[in-house]
Amino acid sequence: GDLLIQKTIKKQVVLEEGTIAFKNWVKTGTEVYRQFWIFDVQNPQEVMMNSSNIQVKQRGPYTYRVRFLAKENVTQDAEDNTVSFLQPNGAIFEPSLSVGTEADNFTVLNLAVAAASHIYQNQFVQMILNSLINKSKSSMFQVRTLRELLWGYRDPFLSLVPYPVTTTVGLFYPYNNTADGVYKVFNGKDNISKVAIIDTYKGKRNLSYWESHCDMINGTDAASFPPFVEKSQVLQFFSSDICRSIYAVFESDVNLKGIPVYRFVLPSKAFASPVENPDNYCFCTEKIISKNCTSYGVLDISKCKEGRPVYISLPHFLYASPDVSEPIDGLNPNEEEHRTYLDIEPITGFTLQFAKRLQVNLLVKPSEKIQVLKNLKRNYIVPILWLNETGTIGDEKANMFRSQVTGKIN
Protein backbone atom coordinates (compact mmCIF):
# COMPACT_ATOMS: atom_id res chain seq x y z
CA GLY A 1 0.00 0.00 0.00
CA ASP A 2 2.66 2.51 1.09
CA LEU A 3 4.78 1.84 -1.98
CA LEU A 4 1.82 2.40 -4.26
CA ILE A 5 1.07 5.72 -2.50
CA GLN A 6 4.71 6.73 -2.75
CA LYS A 7 4.69 5.89 -6.42
CA THR A 8 1.51 7.90 -7.00
CA ILE A 9 2.87 10.88 -5.05
CA LYS A 10 6.15 10.80 -6.92
CA LYS A 11 4.25 10.81 -10.16
CA GLN A 12 1.86 13.59 -9.17
CA VAL A 13 4.43 16.05 -7.77
CA VAL A 14 6.53 16.11 -10.93
CA LEU A 15 6.38 19.52 -12.60
CA GLU A 16 5.10 18.53 -16.01
CA GLU A 17 1.86 18.81 -17.95
CA GLY A 18 -0.89 16.58 -16.57
CA THR A 19 0.13 16.35 -12.88
CA ILE A 20 -1.75 17.87 -9.92
CA ALA A 21 1.42 19.69 -8.91
CA PHE A 22 1.93 21.27 -12.32
CA LYS A 23 -1.62 22.62 -12.56
CA ASN A 24 -1.35 24.34 -9.17
CA TRP A 25 2.22 25.38 -9.79
CA VAL A 26 1.57 27.24 -13.06
CA LYS A 27 -1.24 29.26 -11.47
CA THR A 28 -1.74 29.04 -7.74
CA GLY A 29 -5.23 27.99 -6.74
CA THR A 30 -4.75 29.77 -3.43
CA GLU A 31 -5.71 33.42 -3.00
CA VAL A 32 -2.62 35.27 -1.88
CA TYR A 33 -2.89 38.62 -0.12
CA ARG A 34 -0.22 41.09 0.78
CA GLN A 35 -1.09 43.35 3.71
CA PHE A 36 0.93 46.51 4.30
CA TRP A 37 1.34 48.50 7.50
CA ILE A 38 2.96 51.90 6.96
CA PHE A 39 5.04 53.53 9.68
CA ASP A 40 3.71 57.08 9.89
CA VAL A 41 6.34 59.40 11.40
CA GLN A 42 4.83 61.56 14.14
CA ASN A 43 7.72 63.96 14.84
CA PRO A 44 9.55 64.76 11.58
CA GLN A 45 10.71 68.25 12.65
CA GLU A 46 12.15 67.12 15.99
CA VAL A 47 14.10 64.36 14.28
CA MET A 48 15.49 66.66 11.61
CA MET A 49 16.35 69.52 13.98
CA ASN A 50 17.38 67.69 17.16
CA SER A 51 18.18 64.16 16.05
CA SER A 52 15.40 62.91 18.35
CA ASN A 53 14.17 59.34 18.40
CA ILE A 54 11.80 58.74 15.50
CA GLN A 55 8.25 58.25 16.76
CA VAL A 56 6.30 55.95 14.46
CA LYS A 57 2.72 54.81 14.43
CA GLN A 58 1.81 51.88 12.20
CA ARG A 59 -1.25 52.30 10.00
CA GLY A 60 -2.83 49.36 8.23
CA PRO A 61 -3.60 46.88 6.97
CA TYR A 62 -3.77 48.05 3.36
CA THR A 63 -4.40 44.85 1.41
CA TYR A 64 -3.58 43.83 -2.13
CA ARG A 65 -4.29 40.61 -3.95
CA VAL A 66 -1.03 39.30 -5.40
CA ARG A 67 0.34 36.25 -7.23
CA PHE A 68 -2.87 35.79 -9.21
CA LEU A 69 -1.08 35.66 -12.55
CA ALA A 70 0.02 32.41 -14.13
CA LYS A 71 3.69 31.73 -14.66
CA GLU A 72 4.89 32.83 -18.09
CA ASN A 73 7.30 31.39 -20.67
CA VAL A 74 7.06 27.96 -19.06
CA THR A 75 9.65 25.87 -20.91
CA GLN A 76 10.59 22.27 -20.22
CA ASP A 77 14.14 21.11 -20.85
CA ALA A 78 14.12 17.33 -21.25
CA GLU A 79 17.90 17.19 -21.35
CA ASP A 80 18.56 18.45 -17.83
CA ASN A 81 15.05 17.78 -16.42
CA THR A 82 14.33 21.39 -15.62
CA VAL A 83 11.48 23.79 -16.26
CA SER A 84 12.08 27.50 -16.63
CA PHE A 85 9.57 30.30 -16.13
CA LEU A 86 8.93 33.93 -15.28
CA GLN A 87 6.77 34.84 -12.29
CA PRO A 88 4.76 37.94 -13.31
CA ASN A 89 4.03 40.58 -10.72
CA GLY A 90 0.62 42.10 -10.18
CA ALA A 91 -1.19 43.76 -7.30
CA ILE A 92 -4.87 44.65 -7.00
CA PHE A 93 -6.01 46.83 -4.12
CA GLU A 94 -8.71 45.29 -1.92
CA PRO A 95 -10.65 48.14 -0.27
CA SER A 96 -12.86 45.81 1.77
CA LEU A 97 -9.78 44.29 3.42
CA SER A 98 -8.12 47.66 4.07
CA VAL A 99 -8.42 50.39 6.70
CA GLY A 100 -8.39 53.15 4.12
CA THR A 101 -7.72 53.96 0.49
CA GLU A 102 -4.62 54.14 -1.70
CA ALA A 103 -4.95 57.93 -1.45
CA ASP A 104 -4.26 57.95 2.31
CA ASN A 105 -1.32 60.19 3.24
CA PHE A 106 1.71 59.21 5.31
CA THR A 107 4.72 61.07 6.65
CA VAL A 108 7.72 58.95 5.73
CA LEU A 109 11.43 59.33 5.17
CA ASN A 110 12.30 61.04 1.90
CA LEU A 111 13.54 58.00 -0.01
CA ALA A 112 15.46 59.98 -2.65
CA VAL A 113 17.23 62.24 -0.15
CA ALA A 114 18.28 59.31 2.05
CA ALA A 115 19.44 57.24 -0.91
CA ALA A 116 21.29 60.02 -2.74
CA SER A 117 23.22 61.06 0.35
CA HIS A 118 24.29 57.43 0.82
CA ILE A 119 25.18 56.71 -2.80
CA TYR A 120 27.12 59.95 -3.32
CA GLN A 121 29.60 60.18 -0.46
CA ASN A 122 31.73 62.81 -2.18
CA GLN A 123 31.31 66.13 -0.35
CA PHE A 124 31.24 68.26 -3.47
CA VAL A 125 28.56 66.11 -5.11
CA GLN A 126 26.62 66.24 -1.83
CA MET A 127 26.78 70.03 -1.99
CA ILE A 128 25.36 69.98 -5.51
CA LEU A 129 22.64 67.60 -4.33
CA ASN A 130 21.98 69.90 -1.37
CA SER A 131 21.37 72.84 -3.69
CA LEU A 132 18.91 70.68 -5.69
CA ILE A 133 17.19 69.44 -2.52
CA ASN A 134 16.73 73.05 -1.43
CA LYS A 135 15.60 74.15 -4.90
CA SER A 136 12.98 71.39 -5.02
CA LYS A 137 11.83 72.23 -1.47
CA SER A 138 12.51 68.64 -0.41
CA SER A 139 13.28 67.68 3.17
CA MET A 140 14.34 64.71 5.29
CA PHE A 141 10.72 63.58 5.50
CA GLN A 142 7.90 63.81 2.98
CA VAL A 143 4.17 63.27 2.81
CA ARG A 144 3.16 60.64 0.26
CA THR A 145 0.02 58.66 -0.54
CA LEU A 146 0.05 54.91 -0.14
CA ARG A 147 -0.08 54.48 -3.91
CA GLU A 148 2.91 56.78 -4.40
CA LEU A 149 4.96 55.18 -1.65
CA LEU A 150 4.44 51.62 -2.88
CA TRP A 151 4.17 51.91 -6.63
CA GLY A 152 6.07 55.09 -7.45
CA TYR A 153 6.01 58.87 -7.83
CA ARG A 154 8.06 61.44 -9.69
CA ASP A 155 10.52 62.85 -7.18
CA PRO A 156 10.95 66.65 -7.41
CA PHE A 157 14.56 66.56 -6.23
CA LEU A 158 15.66 63.79 -8.59
CA SER A 159 13.90 65.60 -11.43
CA LEU A 160 16.49 68.39 -11.06
CA VAL A 161 19.53 66.08 -11.09
CA PRO A 162 21.45 66.68 -14.34
CA TYR A 163 22.78 63.13 -14.39
CA PRO A 164 20.60 60.52 -16.16
CA VAL A 165 18.86 59.08 -13.10
CA THR A 166 15.47 57.42 -12.71
CA THR A 167 13.25 60.19 -11.40
CA THR A 168 10.47 57.82 -10.34
CA VAL A 169 10.79 56.46 -6.82
CA GLY A 170 8.71 53.85 -5.00
CA LEU A 171 9.41 51.01 -2.62
CA PHE A 172 8.12 48.46 -5.12
CA TYR A 173 8.61 50.46 -8.31
CA PRO A 174 8.40 49.06 -10.93
CA TYR A 175 5.95 46.27 -10.04
CA ASN A 176 2.86 45.83 -12.21
CA ASN A 177 3.75 44.55 -15.69
CA THR A 178 7.11 43.24 -14.49
CA ALA A 179 8.19 39.68 -13.75
CA ASP A 180 10.59 37.96 -11.38
CA GLY A 181 13.07 35.53 -12.92
CA VAL A 182 13.91 33.74 -15.14
CA TYR A 183 13.78 30.81 -12.70
CA LYS A 184 14.97 27.41 -13.84
CA VAL A 185 13.90 24.65 -11.45
CA PHE A 186 14.22 20.87 -11.46
CA ASN A 187 11.01 19.21 -12.59
CA GLY A 188 11.70 16.02 -10.62
CA LYS A 189 11.35 13.62 -13.55
CA ASP A 190 14.69 11.96 -13.00
CA ASN A 191 14.99 12.58 -9.27
CA ILE A 192 11.91 13.46 -7.24
CA SER A 193 14.03 14.61 -4.31
CA LYS A 194 15.11 17.58 -6.44
CA VAL A 195 11.64 18.68 -7.56
CA ALA A 196 11.07 22.47 -7.44
CA ILE A 197 14.66 23.09 -6.33
CA ILE A 198 16.08 26.09 -8.14
CA ASP A 199 18.87 25.28 -10.56
CA THR A 200 19.47 28.85 -11.76
CA TYR A 201 18.00 32.32 -11.19
CA LYS A 202 18.44 34.90 -13.93
CA GLY A 203 20.74 32.42 -15.63
CA LYS A 204 23.11 32.08 -12.67
CA ARG A 205 23.66 29.71 -9.75
CA ASN A 206 24.87 32.59 -7.60
CA LEU A 207 23.49 36.02 -6.80
CA SER A 208 26.66 38.17 -6.92
CA TYR A 209 25.43 40.12 -3.87
CA TRP A 210 27.24 38.27 -1.12
CA GLU A 211 30.53 36.55 -0.41
CA SER A 212 31.03 32.80 -0.04
CA HIS A 213 28.07 30.49 0.75
CA CYS A 214 25.76 33.44 1.45
CA ASP A 215 25.65 34.07 -2.30
CA MET A 216 24.21 30.66 -3.14
CA ILE A 217 20.71 30.11 -4.47
CA ASN A 218 19.49 27.29 -2.26
CA GLY A 219 16.35 25.21 -2.25
CA THR A 220 12.97 26.05 -3.76
CA ASP A 221 10.92 29.25 -3.90
CA ALA A 222 9.02 28.03 -0.78
CA ALA A 223 5.75 27.36 -2.68
CA SER A 224 6.59 23.67 -2.47
CA PHE A 225 9.37 21.34 -1.41
CA PRO A 226 10.40 17.85 -2.50
CA PRO A 227 7.90 15.26 -1.12
CA PHE A 228 8.16 13.23 2.06
CA VAL A 229 9.27 16.09 4.30
CA GLU A 230 10.77 15.06 7.63
CA LYS A 231 10.49 17.09 10.83
CA SER A 232 14.26 16.93 11.21
CA GLN A 233 14.83 18.65 7.86
CA VAL A 234 16.07 22.18 7.45
CA LEU A 235 14.09 23.56 4.52
CA GLN A 236 16.13 25.88 2.34
CA PHE A 237 14.45 28.38 0.05
CA PHE A 238 15.33 31.46 -1.96
CA SER A 239 13.42 34.73 -1.68
CA SER A 240 14.09 37.38 -4.31
CA ASP A 241 12.36 39.94 -2.04
CA ILE A 242 15.21 39.72 0.43
CA CYS A 243 17.91 38.94 -2.15
CA ARG A 244 19.07 35.81 -0.36
CA SER A 245 18.45 32.19 0.45
CA ILE A 246 17.20 31.42 3.93
CA TYR A 247 15.88 28.40 5.82
CA ALA A 248 13.03 27.20 8.01
CA VAL A 249 12.96 24.61 10.78
CA PHE A 250 10.13 22.47 12.14
CA GLU A 251 8.15 24.02 14.98
CA SER A 252 4.90 22.11 15.46
CA ASP A 253 2.20 19.87 14.05
CA VAL A 254 -0.82 21.82 12.85
CA ASN A 255 -4.23 20.69 11.61
CA LEU A 256 -5.20 22.77 8.61
CA LYS A 257 -8.80 22.19 7.49
CA GLY A 258 -8.48 18.54 8.46
CA ILE A 259 -5.09 18.12 6.78
CA PRO A 260 -2.10 17.35 9.04
CA VAL A 261 0.68 19.82 8.20
CA TYR A 262 4.09 20.63 9.58
CA ARG A 263 4.64 24.21 10.64
CA PHE A 264 8.14 25.35 9.69
CA VAL A 265 9.36 28.73 10.95
CA LEU A 266 12.28 31.02 10.24
CA PRO A 267 14.33 30.76 13.44
CA SER A 268 15.91 33.73 15.19
CA LYS A 269 19.28 32.08 14.48
CA ALA A 270 18.82 32.91 10.80
CA PHE A 271 18.91 36.62 11.74
CA ALA A 272 21.69 36.36 14.33
CA SER A 273 25.02 38.14 14.13
CA PRO A 274 28.13 36.17 13.14
CA VAL A 275 29.10 36.31 16.82
CA GLU A 276 26.18 34.01 17.63
CA ASN A 277 25.86 32.26 14.26
CA PRO A 278 29.22 32.14 12.45
CA ASP A 279 27.51 31.03 9.22
CA ASN A 280 26.11 34.53 8.92
CA TYR A 281 29.52 36.22 8.60
CA CYS A 282 29.04 36.75 4.87
CA PHE A 283 25.75 38.62 5.37
CA CYS A 284 27.69 41.30 7.25
CA THR A 285 28.87 43.57 4.44
CA GLU A 286 30.19 46.60 6.31
CA LYS A 287 31.60 47.37 9.72
CA ILE A 288 30.19 50.76 10.78
CA ILE A 289 26.40 50.35 10.74
CA SER A 290 26.73 46.75 11.91
CA LYS A 291 28.99 47.83 14.78
CA ASN A 292 31.72 45.47 13.67
CA CYS A 293 29.19 42.75 12.76
CA THR A 294 27.75 42.61 16.28
CA SER A 295 24.34 44.06 15.34
CA TYR A 296 21.74 41.56 14.23
CA GLY A 297 18.27 41.29 12.79
CA VAL A 298 18.79 43.64 9.84
CA LEU A 299 20.09 42.73 6.41
CA ASP A 300 21.82 45.29 4.23
CA ILE A 301 20.57 44.55 0.70
CA SER A 302 21.96 47.74 -0.89
CA LYS A 303 24.04 45.73 -3.36
CA CYS A 304 20.82 44.21 -4.67
CA LYS A 305 19.10 47.63 -4.84
CA GLU A 306 21.52 49.65 -7.01
CA GLY A 307 23.31 50.98 -3.96
CA ARG A 308 20.20 52.36 -2.27
CA PRO A 309 20.58 51.80 1.49
CA VAL A 310 17.73 49.32 1.91
CA TYR A 311 17.73 47.14 5.01
CA ILE A 312 15.39 44.19 5.42
CA SER A 313 14.27 43.00 8.83
CA LEU A 314 11.36 41.24 10.44
CA PRO A 315 8.41 43.50 11.35
CA HIS A 316 8.94 45.81 14.32
CA PHE A 317 12.58 44.66 14.36
CA LEU A 318 11.65 41.25 15.77
CA TYR A 319 14.85 39.29 16.55
CA ALA A 320 16.95 42.45 16.05
CA SER A 321 19.59 43.83 18.40
CA PRO A 322 18.57 46.64 20.79
CA ASP A 323 20.87 49.16 19.09
CA VAL A 324 18.82 48.85 15.89
CA SER A 325 15.46 49.67 17.45
CA GLU A 326 16.78 52.09 20.10
CA PRO A 327 16.37 55.26 17.95
CA ILE A 328 12.80 54.28 16.99
CA ASP A 329 9.82 54.71 19.34
CA GLY A 330 6.51 52.94 18.81
CA LEU A 331 7.60 49.44 17.86
CA ASN A 332 6.13 46.35 19.56
CA PRO A 333 7.60 43.15 18.16
CA ASN A 334 5.89 39.86 18.89
CA GLU A 335 6.54 36.43 17.42
CA GLU A 336 2.93 35.47 16.72
CA GLU A 337 2.27 38.49 14.54
CA HIS A 338 5.68 39.18 13.07
CA ARG A 339 7.48 35.91 12.33
CA THR A 340 7.37 33.99 9.05
CA TYR A 341 5.99 30.46 8.86
CA LEU A 342 5.22 27.81 6.24
CA ASP A 343 2.62 25.07 6.79
CA ILE A 344 3.77 22.15 4.68
CA GLU A 345 1.86 19.01 3.90
CA PRO A 346 4.69 16.51 4.44
CA ILE A 347 3.72 13.82 1.91
CA THR A 348 3.52 16.07 -1.13
CA GLY A 349 5.81 18.84 0.15
CA PHE A 350 3.20 21.43 -0.85
CA THR A 351 2.99 24.64 1.16
CA LEU A 352 -0.73 24.79 1.98
CA GLN A 353 -0.58 27.88 4.17
CA PHE A 354 2.06 30.51 4.75
CA ALA A 355 2.67 33.91 6.26
CA LYS A 356 5.70 35.72 4.93
CA ARG A 357 6.48 38.79 7.00
CA LEU A 358 9.18 41.34 6.37
CA GLN A 359 9.93 44.99 6.99
CA VAL A 360 11.50 47.47 4.60
CA ASN A 361 13.83 49.98 6.21
CA LEU A 362 16.07 52.72 4.84
CA LEU A 363 19.33 53.90 6.31
CA VAL A 364 19.74 57.63 6.76
CA LYS A 365 23.03 59.10 7.91
CA PRO A 366 24.15 62.55 9.01
CA SER A 367 25.63 64.61 6.20
CA GLU A 368 27.71 67.67 6.80
CA LYS A 369 26.89 69.09 3.39
CA ILE A 370 23.20 68.23 3.07
CA GLN A 371 21.31 70.78 5.09
CA VAL A 372 18.28 68.62 5.90
CA LEU A 373 20.56 65.87 7.30
CA LYS A 374 23.08 68.18 8.93
CA ASN A 375 21.65 68.15 12.45
CA LEU A 376 21.52 64.38 12.71
CA LYS A 377 23.86 63.07 15.37
CA ARG A 378 23.51 59.36 14.56
CA ASN A 379 22.58 56.85 11.91
CA TYR A 380 19.00 55.66 11.73
CA ILE A 381 17.67 52.50 10.14
CA VAL A 382 14.22 53.93 9.50
CA PRO A 383 11.24 51.55 9.21
CA ILE A 384 9.08 52.49 6.23
CA LEU A 385 6.58 49.64 6.19
CA TRP A 386 6.08 46.01 7.00
CA LEU A 387 4.15 43.44 5.04
CA ASN A 388 2.36 40.19 5.67
CA GLU A 389 1.92 38.02 2.59
CA THR A 390 -0.46 35.16 3.30
CA GLY A 391 -2.07 32.29 1.48
CA THR A 392 -4.27 29.46 2.68
CA ILE A 393 -5.58 26.51 0.73
CA GLY A 394 -9.26 27.00 -0.16
CA ASP A 395 -11.99 24.78 1.31
CA GLU A 396 -12.69 23.06 -2.01
CA LYS A 397 -9.01 22.34 -2.61
CA ALA A 398 -8.64 21.16 0.98
CA ASN A 399 -11.48 18.65 0.51
CA MET A 400 -9.89 17.40 -2.69
CA PHE A 401 -6.53 17.16 -0.93
CA ARG A 402 -8.04 15.23 2.00
CA SER A 403 -9.81 12.74 -0.21
CA GLN A 404 -7.01 12.21 -2.72
CA VAL A 405 -3.90 12.42 -0.54
CA THR A 406 -4.20 12.34 3.24
CA GLY A 407 -7.42 10.28 3.27
CA LYS A 408 -5.83 7.55 1.19
CA ILE A 409 -2.85 7.34 3.51
CA ASN A 410 -4.84 7.28 6.72
Epitope: F124, V125, M127, I128, N130, S131, P162, Y163, E368, Q371
Partner: antibody, heavy 123, light 107 residues
Amino acid sequence: EVQLVESGGGLVQPGESLKLSCESNEYEFPSHDMSWVRKTPEKRLELVAAINSDGGYTYYPDTMERRFIISRDNTKKTLYLQMSSLRSEDTALYYCARHGYDYDEEGAWFAYWGQGTLVTVSA
Amino acid sequence: ETTVTQSPASLSMAIGEKVTIRCITSTDIDDDMNWYQQKPGEPPKLLISEGNTLRPGVPSRFSSTGYGTDFVFSIENMLSEDVADYYCLQSDNLPFTFGSGTKLEIK
Protein backbone atom coordinates in the same frame (compact mmCIF):
# COMPACT_ATOMS: atom_id res chain seq x y z
CA GLU B 1 54.14 69.14 -7.46
CA VAL B 2 50.66 69.80 -8.86
CA GLN B 3 50.74 72.09 -11.88
CA LEU B 4 47.68 73.58 -13.51
CA VAL B 5 48.18 75.61 -16.68
CA GLU B 6 45.32 77.71 -18.08
CA SER B 7 45.14 78.89 -21.68
CA GLY B 8 42.65 80.32 -24.16
CA GLY B 9 42.18 83.79 -22.71
CA GLY B 10 42.33 86.94 -24.77
CA LEU B 11 40.52 90.03 -25.98
CA VAL B 12 37.02 89.49 -27.36
CA GLN B 13 34.05 91.66 -28.23
CA PRO B 14 30.76 91.55 -26.30
CA GLY B 15 28.54 88.68 -27.47
CA GLU B 16 31.46 86.57 -28.64
CA SER B 17 32.59 83.18 -27.34
CA LEU B 18 35.80 81.82 -25.91
CA LYS B 19 36.97 78.41 -24.72
CA LEU B 20 39.42 78.18 -21.84
CA SER B 21 41.52 75.10 -21.11
CA CYS B 22 43.36 74.01 -18.01
CA GLU B 23 45.93 71.26 -18.32
CA SER B 24 47.08 69.23 -15.34
CA ASN B 25 50.36 67.38 -14.95
CA GLU B 26 48.76 65.06 -12.45
CA TYR B 27 48.20 61.36 -12.90
CA GLU B 28 45.45 61.64 -10.25
CA PHE B 29 43.54 64.30 -12.21
CA PRO B 30 40.49 62.00 -12.78
CA SER B 31 40.05 61.65 -9.01
CA HIS B 32 39.59 65.32 -8.25
CA ASP B 33 36.70 67.76 -8.41
CA MET B 34 37.63 70.96 -10.25
CA SER B 35 36.41 74.55 -10.49
CA TRP B 36 36.86 77.75 -12.44
CA VAL B 37 37.20 80.85 -10.26
CA ARG B 38 37.65 84.37 -11.55
CA LYS B 39 39.19 87.52 -10.13
CA THR B 40 37.51 90.69 -11.31
CA PRO B 41 39.27 94.03 -11.90
CA GLU B 42 37.75 95.09 -8.53
CA LYS B 43 39.74 92.22 -6.98
CA ARG B 44 36.66 90.15 -6.15
CA LEU B 45 36.96 86.36 -6.31
CA GLU B 46 33.92 84.56 -7.75
CA LEU B 47 33.08 80.93 -8.39
CA VAL B 48 32.25 80.52 -12.06
CA ALA B 49 31.60 76.78 -12.40
CA ALA B 50 32.50 73.47 -10.80
CA ILE B 51 32.56 69.84 -11.90
CA ASN B 52 32.94 66.55 -10.07
CA SER B 53 35.68 64.02 -10.76
CA ASP B 54 33.91 61.95 -13.42
CA GLY B 55 32.19 64.92 -15.06
CA GLY B 56 28.72 63.67 -14.19
CA TYR B 57 27.82 66.57 -11.94
CA THR B 58 28.31 70.23 -12.77
CA TYR B 59 27.42 73.34 -10.84
CA TYR B 60 26.94 76.96 -11.89
CA PRO B 61 25.93 79.84 -9.61
CA ASP B 62 22.62 81.37 -10.67
CA THR B 63 24.45 84.62 -11.43
CA MET B 64 26.29 82.91 -14.31
CA GLU B 65 22.96 82.51 -16.14
CA ARG B 66 24.07 79.32 -17.92
CA ARG B 67 26.21 81.17 -20.43
CA PHE B 68 29.19 79.08 -19.41
CA ILE B 69 29.70 75.31 -19.71
CA ILE B 70 32.30 73.45 -17.68
CA SER B 71 33.56 70.09 -18.91
CA ARG B 72 36.56 67.83 -18.59
CA ASP B 73 38.46 65.21 -20.52
CA ASN B 74 40.07 62.92 -17.97
CA THR B 75 42.05 61.07 -20.63
CA LYS B 76 43.71 64.38 -21.57
CA LYS B 77 43.83 65.56 -17.94
CA THR B 78 42.21 68.79 -19.10
CA LEU B 79 39.44 71.01 -17.75
CA TYR B 80 37.46 73.31 -20.04
CA LEU B 81 35.25 76.36 -19.78
CA GLN B 82 33.15 77.23 -22.82
CA MET B 83 32.05 80.85 -22.49
CA SER B 84 29.38 82.34 -24.74
CA SER B 85 27.50 85.66 -25.00
CA LEU B 86 30.38 87.34 -23.22
CA ARG B 87 29.81 90.71 -21.54
CA SER B 88 32.13 93.41 -20.28
CA GLU B 89 31.45 92.27 -16.69
CA ASP B 90 33.01 88.90 -17.55
CA THR B 91 36.38 90.64 -17.84
CA ALA B 92 38.57 88.91 -15.27
CA LEU B 93 41.55 86.69 -14.61
CA TYR B 94 40.21 83.09 -14.86
CA TYR B 95 41.79 80.46 -12.63
CA CYS B 96 41.25 76.75 -12.61
CA ALA B 97 41.42 75.22 -9.15
CA ARG B 98 41.61 71.69 -7.86
CA HIS B 99 39.74 70.54 -4.77
CA GLY B 100 41.36 68.42 -2.11
CA TYR B 101 44.79 67.42 -0.92
CA ASP B 102 46.10 63.94 -1.65
CA TYR B 103 45.85 62.82 1.94
CA ASP B 104 42.78 64.84 2.83
CA GLU B 105 40.13 64.84 0.14
CA GLU B 106 37.35 66.44 2.10
CA GLY B 107 37.12 70.04 3.21
CA ALA B 108 40.08 71.44 1.27
CA TRP B 109 38.39 73.49 -1.42
CA PHE B 110 40.52 75.18 -4.10
CA ALA B 111 43.67 73.59 -2.72
CA TYR B 112 45.71 74.11 -5.88
CA TRP B 113 45.42 76.92 -8.42
CA GLY B 114 46.82 77.65 -11.85
CA GLN B 115 48.41 81.01 -12.70
CA GLY B 116 45.26 82.18 -14.48
CA THR B 117 44.39 83.33 -17.99
CA LEU B 118 43.12 86.84 -18.66
CA VAL B 119 39.83 87.37 -20.47
CA THR B 120 39.05 90.90 -21.61
CA VAL B 121 35.63 91.67 -23.05
CA SER B 122 35.60 95.06 -24.73
CA ALA B 123 34.17 96.75 -27.78
CA GLU C 1 23.08 82.25 -1.21
CA THR C 2 25.33 82.91 1.78
CA THR C 3 26.91 86.34 1.64
CA VAL C 4 30.27 86.91 3.32
CA THR C 5 31.16 90.32 4.73
CA GLN C 6 34.91 90.78 5.23
CA SER C 7 36.54 93.60 7.19
CA PRO C 8 38.62 95.66 7.10
CA ALA C 9 39.13 96.26 3.37
CA SER C 10 42.72 97.28 4.03
CA LEU C 11 45.10 97.08 6.94
CA SER C 12 48.44 98.72 7.60
CA MET C 13 50.44 97.00 10.33
CA ALA C 14 53.96 97.15 11.71
CA ILE C 15 56.26 94.11 11.56
CA GLY C 16 55.75 91.92 14.65
CA GLU C 17 52.23 93.14 15.30
CA LYS C 18 49.17 90.88 15.50
CA VAL C 19 46.88 91.06 12.50
CA THR C 20 43.18 90.20 12.72
CA ILE C 21 40.71 89.97 9.86
CA ARG C 22 37.02 89.23 10.35
CA CYS C 23 34.39 87.57 8.18
CA ILE C 24 30.70 87.45 9.00
CA THR C 25 28.31 85.18 7.09
CA SER C 26 24.61 85.74 6.45
CA THR C 27 23.79 82.13 7.40
CA ASP C 28 25.11 79.66 9.96
CA ILE C 29 27.93 77.76 8.24
CA ASP C 30 29.22 75.73 11.23
CA ASP C 31 33.03 75.83 10.88
CA ASP C 32 33.11 75.68 7.08
CA MET C 33 35.32 78.72 6.59
CA ASN C 34 38.58 78.81 4.62
CA TRP C 35 41.28 81.47 4.39
CA TYR C 36 43.48 82.31 1.38
CA GLN C 37 46.53 84.46 0.83
CA GLN C 38 47.23 86.05 -2.55
CA LYS C 39 50.48 87.79 -3.29
CA PRO C 40 50.85 90.08 -6.36
CA GLY C 41 51.20 88.10 -9.59
CA GLU C 42 50.45 84.79 -7.87
CA PRO C 43 47.33 82.66 -7.55
CA PRO C 44 45.59 82.43 -4.18
CA LYS C 45 47.06 79.97 -1.68
CA LEU C 46 44.97 78.02 0.80
CA LEU C 47 46.24 78.67 4.34
CA ILE C 48 43.41 77.41 6.53
CA SER C 49 40.62 75.06 5.53
CA GLU C 50 37.32 74.00 7.11
CA GLY C 51 37.39 73.34 10.83
CA ASN C 52 40.12 75.94 11.39
CA THR C 53 42.64 73.47 9.97
CA LEU C 54 46.10 74.86 9.23
CA ARG C 55 47.26 73.43 5.91
CA PRO C 56 50.56 71.52 5.68
CA GLY C 57 53.59 73.78 5.30
CA VAL C 58 51.75 76.90 6.49
CA PRO C 59 53.58 78.66 9.38
CA SER C 60 51.95 78.37 12.78
CA ARG C 61 51.74 82.16 13.17
CA PHE C 62 48.60 81.89 11.01
CA SER C 63 45.44 80.78 12.80
CA SER C 64 41.69 81.13 12.73
CA THR C 65 38.74 80.79 15.08
CA GLY C 66 35.02 80.93 14.71
CA TYR C 67 31.85 78.93 14.32
CA GLY C 68 28.41 79.71 13.02
CA THR C 69 28.47 83.19 11.50
CA ASP C 70 31.50 84.95 13.02
CA PHE C 71 35.08 84.12 12.01
CA VAL C 72 38.46 85.66 12.75
CA PHE C 73 41.76 85.09 10.96
CA SER C 74 44.98 86.06 12.77
CA ILE C 75 48.67 86.48 12.07
CA GLU C 76 50.49 86.38 15.40
CA ASN C 77 53.75 88.23 14.52
CA MET C 78 53.49 89.84 11.15
CA LEU C 79 56.50 89.43 8.83
CA SER C 80 57.25 91.42 5.70
CA GLU C 81 56.53 88.32 3.58
CA ASP C 82 52.95 88.39 4.82
CA VAL C 83 52.14 91.44 2.71
CA ALA C 84 49.31 90.18 0.47
CA ASP C 85 45.57 90.16 -0.08
CA TYR C 86 43.63 87.83 2.21
CA TYR C 87 40.28 86.28 1.39
CA CYS C 88 37.82 84.18 3.35
CA LEU C 89 35.63 81.59 1.63
CA GLN C 90 32.52 79.88 2.98
CA SER C 91 32.27 76.25 1.85
CA ASP C 92 29.14 75.25 3.74
CA ASN C 93 26.87 75.52 0.72
CA LEU C 94 26.85 76.30 -2.98
CA PRO C 95 27.67 78.70 -4.43
CA PHE C 96 30.94 78.97 -2.55
CA THR C 97 31.23 82.66 -1.73
CA PHE C 98 34.34 84.71 -1.01
CA GLY C 99 34.77 87.73 1.20
CA SER C 100 35.68 90.95 -0.61
CA GLY C 101 39.32 90.71 0.52
CA THR C 102 41.65 92.52 2.88
CA LYS C 103 44.79 94.22 1.62
CA LEU C 104 47.57 93.87 4.21
CA GLU C 105 50.42 96.36 4.01
CA ILE C 106 53.42 97.30 6.18
CA LYS C 107 53.09 100.47 8.22
